[in-house]
């Protein structure tokens, strides 16, 4: 581990003196002196600072721009930034969630492995043998082929990854 520095945790060094940092939610107004404590002031409305700091300006809360498909997931405080998320059917383009894109749909032949969230896109997977998807969807999984046998029917047309099997009646034995 790093050896300890001249000033303790939650202090900073200025002009050969250790001053107290400002607590989260407050900004620095003036450094301490030999005779006075550090002077701090609370951040204003729509501003925040999330660490012990010596910042002279608070940061502005993030704006969740509806024109970019964003909405507020969690309102910011003096100590935390606003958290944005995307409108229903959309997801963030980055971890910072600065804009949104429409969830992708899984094409026919593919099913939804994982439904999209506000922060992650749809994950598709190819329908394996015995399963199919005949629609483009952001929700539908691959469906299993119909089991003709359980209906006392026979397969008239084999299924594919995009189509279900076609069942039909069994051929009657001729006399």
């Amino acid at each position: 581990p790093e050896p300890p520095t001249a000033c303790r945790e939650k202090q900073y060094l200025i002009n050969s003196q250790c001053c107290s940092l400002c607590q989260p939610g407050q900004k620095l107004v003036s450094d301490c002196t030999e005779f006075t404590e550090t002077e701090c002031l609370p951040c204003g409305e729509s501003e925040f600072l999330d660490t012990w700091n010596r910042e002279t300006h608070c940061h502005q809360h993030k704006y969740c721009d509806p024109n970019l498909g964003l909405r507020v997931q969690q309102k910011g405080t003096s100590e935390t930034d606003t958290i944005c998320t995307c409108e229903e059917g959309w997801h963030c383009t980055s971890e910072a969630c600065e804009s949104c894109v429409l969830h992708r749909s899984c094409s026919p032949g593919f099913g939804v492995k994982q439904i999209a969230t506000g922060v992650s896109d749809t994950i598709c997977e190819p329908c394996p043998v015995g399963f199919f998807s005949n629609v483009s969807s952001a929700f539908e999984k691959c469906h299993p082929w119909t089991s003709c046998e359980t209906k006392d029917l026979v397969v008239q047309q084999a299924g594919t990854n995009k189509t279900d099997v076609v069942c039909g009646p069994q051929d009657r034995l001729r006399a």
């Epitope: 001249a6 002009n15 050969s16 003196q17 030999e34």
Partner: antibody
Framework: QVRLQQSGAELVRPGTSMRVSCKAS????????INWVKQRPGQGLEWIGI????????NYNENFKDKATLTADKSSNTAYMQLSSLTSEDSAVYFC?????????WGQGTLVTVSA | DIQMTQTTSSLSASLGDRVTISCRAS??????LNWYQQKPDGTVKLLIY???GLHSGVPSRFNGSGSGTDYSLTISNLEQEDIATYFC?????????FGGGTKLEIK
């Protein structure tokens, strides 16, 4: 009144180590930081590092990280600077200085001469 | 590192003169500029701290001013005992750094 009394001049051999002492009086020793500064003729003043005598915590100038070690003995109100692997480049006057405000009170300086 | 520059390395003035010594930082140092006096015998004293604060026991003929990157020390009514070398030093960020010094001599 505030006083920083440094150890006397020293003549040391290249490759050896030595320690400069700085005895503080006239104030609460652990309440103020101690700086060390190097002065070579015609080379100006160079800050070596700063020590918190209360906690033993330090900050060093990168140029002196492998050269100087700052410590303190609270029981005797004395700060120390150990200099290692001495070369002719280390020949200088070294000052200990009490902080706040700025470099407020200076010791009289200790002349270190490195010579074979 | 922040570079501190004292462009005038030596200065001659007469007793009773008003003398100004300047110092420039390579970047904004807020107000954290200190001035020191080193006498010919090597003793060093703090004169001015944080641009304009007069250290205890320092005569009021010493005055500091400046902001941002440009600072100055003014000695009004120069006296014989003011013959010394004057150094500026920034206390804003580590490593602390000094100017090269201005040697003040009597004409």
């Amino acid at each position: 009144q505030v006083r920083l009394q440094q150890s006397g001049a020293e003549l040391v051999r290249p490759g050896t180590s030595m320690r400069v002492s700085c005895k503080a009086s006239g104030y609460a020793f652990t309440n103020y930081l101690i700086n060390w500064v190097k002065q070579r003729p015609g080379q100006g003043l160079e800050w070596i590092g700063i020590l918190n005598p209360g906690s033993g915590g330090t900050n060093y100038n990168e140029n002196f990280k492998d050269k100087a070690t700052l410590t303190a003995d609270k029981s005797s109100n004395t700060a120390y600077m150990q200099l290692s692997s001495l070369t002719s480049e280390d020949s200088a006057v070294y000052f200990c200085i009490r902080g706040s405000p700025g470099f407020a009170y200076w010791g009289q300086g200790t002349l270190v001469t490195v010579s074979a | 590192d922040i570079q501190m520059t004292q462009t005038t390395s030596s200065l001659s003035a007469s007793l009773g003169d008003r003398v100004t010594i300047s110092c420039r930082a390579s970047q904004d140092i807020n107000i954290y500029l200190n001035w020191y006096q080193q006498k010919p015998d090597g003793t060093v004293k703090l004169l001015i701290y944080s641009t304009s604060g007069l250290h205890s026991g320092v005569p009021s003929r010493f005055n500091g001013s400046g902001s941002g990157t440009d600072y100055s020390l003014t000695i009004s009514n120069l006296e014989q005992e003011d013959i010394a070398t004057y150094f500026c030093q920034q206390g804003y960020t580590l490593p602390y750094t000094f100017g090269g010094g201005t040697k003040l001599e009597i004409k």
